[in-house]
Interface confidence: low
């Protein structure tokens, strides 16, 4: 499977909410011995590999934000810790995987990475990630609502796999 990032850039005004989205593409095994982990973190555009560095989102680490579920299940964080920080990550039955950030501030600007790991028990893992930029703006040049910029076909297959 692959991870697509439908939008590579989100430009939002301060105070707005935004939902960053990744999507699983391709065949997804739904067997009983397969489990998915999905999470979000901030990163920087490294010279070698984007998303290799894992920084917290609003002081929450990728551990705090991770979801785990079998192939047939949907999942969301819903726990108090994330919600207290104005965050919620969620996943549906259709391969969509998102994090919602409420009441954006300028400090939220940066590179965000989604990571999906397929674990096959007794076998090796398969890891893929996607990256997108969030720009939070203030002042007269800021949009009134979030503006999203679709990924190019190349960017939307913005993946690394192992």
């Amino acid at each position: 499977f692959k991870v697509a990032t439908p939008y590579s850039l989100y430009v939002c005004p301060e105070g707005q909410n935004v939902t960053l989205t990744c999507r699983l593409l391709g065949p997804v095994d739904k067997g009983h011995d397969v489990t998915f982990y999905k999470t979000w973190y901030r990163s920087s555009r490294g010279e070698v590999q984007t998303c290799s560095e894992r920084r917290p989102i609003r002081n929450l680490t990728f551990q705090d934000l991770h979801l785990h579920h079998g192939g047939h299940q949907a999942a969301n964080t819903s726990h108090d810790l994330a919600q207290r920080h104005g965050l919620e990550s969620a996943s549906d039955h259709h391969g969509n995987f998102s994090i919602t950030m409420r009441n954006l501030t300028l400090l939220d600007s940066g590179l965000y990475c989604c990571l999906v790991v397929e674990i096959r028990h007794h076998h090796s893992e398969h890891r893929v990630h996607g990256a997108m930029e969030l720009q939070v703006q203030t002042g007269k040049d800021a949009p009134s609502n979030c503006v999203v910029y679709p990924s190019s076909s190349q960017d939307s297959e913005n993946i690394t796999a192992a």
């Epitope: 011995d33 489990t35 982990y37 999470t39 490294g46 070698v48 590999q49 290799s52 560095e53 894992r54 990728f62 551990q63 991770h66 785990h68 790991v117 674990i119 028990h121 007794h122 090796s124 893992e125 890891r127 690394t160 192992a162």
Partner: antibody
Framework: QVQLVQSGAEVKKPGSSVKVSCKAS????????ISWVRQAPGQGLEWMGG????????NYAQKFQGRVTITADESTSTAYMELSSLRSEDTAVYYC?????????????WGQGTLVTVSS | DIQMTQSPSSLSASVGDRVTITCRAS??????LNWYQQKPGKAPKLLIY???SLQSGVPSRFSGSGSGTDFTLTISSLQPEDFATYYC?????????FGQGTKVEIK
């Protein structure tokens, strides 16, 4: 702060088994892989296998397959490693180590180590 | 299995020296490469993850680089507490494998 506390040193006879425990505190237990890594005297580090407690299924290095059993008890936040058919070359310090996120095998927290001596 | 080969196996250096340790993987592991420090009688300590990311609480004199098959751990200015054995480890595929270690000794 996450802490991994292992059981005490063991002296065993060749052919017997040993079971080492690793009790976790200070963090979520179920969602993080616990691995066992051993180190023979004066030697390097060797990964034996690992388990993510919430899944309940362990993965083992081929070298130890059939001789090692890794289990986890979520109710007590304790992982166990049992090694059977012991031989003298199994004399080593056995460490439990926690992965820094659920499915990864980069180890950010380690137990203090348990010395297992196999001697007749 | 992926074989990890470190060089040198040991080195002697003085406080303040710049020290470089290399690690080579038998096949490409992208940046799934971690570095540990171990002192006698103690458990290893994670220094660098994902080839170049500094683990929280680790001094900035430690840095890592590389991708694919060739990786480097650099200590920019060796301190007395840095004399130890250093291990690389790949977590690209199971089984997880470590390098044989590099012992950094006082000259």
């Amino acid at each position: 702060q996450v802490q991994l506390v292992q059981s005490g040193a063991e002296v065993k006879k060749p052919g017997s088994s040993v079971k080492v425990s690793c009790k976790a505190s200070g963090g979520t237990f179920s969602s993080y892989a616990i691995s066992w890594v051993r180190q023979a005297p004066g030697q390097g580090l060797e990964w034996m296998g690992g388990i993510i407690p919430i899944f309940g299924t362990a993965n083992y290095a081929q070298k130890f397959q059939g001789r090692v059993t890794i289990t986890a008890d979520e109710s007590t936040s304790t992982a166990y490693m049992e090694l059977s058919s012991l031989r003298s070359e199994d004399t080593a310090v056995y460490y439990c180590a926690r992965s820094s996120y659920g499915w990864s095998y980069e180890f950010d927290y380690w137990g203090q180590g348990t010395l297992v001596t196999v001697s007749s | 299995d992926i074989q990890m080969t470190q060089s040198p196996s040991s080195l002697s250096a003085s406080v303040g020296d710049r020290v470089t340790i290399t690690c080579r993987a038998s096949q490409s592991i992208a940046t799934y490469l971690n570095w540990y420090q171990q002192k006698p009688g103690k458990a290893p300590k994670l220094l660098i993850y994902a080839a170049s990311s500094l683990q929280s609480g680790v001094p900035s004199r430690f840095s890592g680089s590389g991708s694919g098959t060739d990786f480097t751990l650099t200590i920019s200015s060796l301190q007395p507490e840095d004399f130890a054995t250093y291990y690389c480890q790949q977590n690209h595929n199971r089984p997880i494998t470590f390098g044989q270690g590099t012992k950094v000794e006082i000259k």
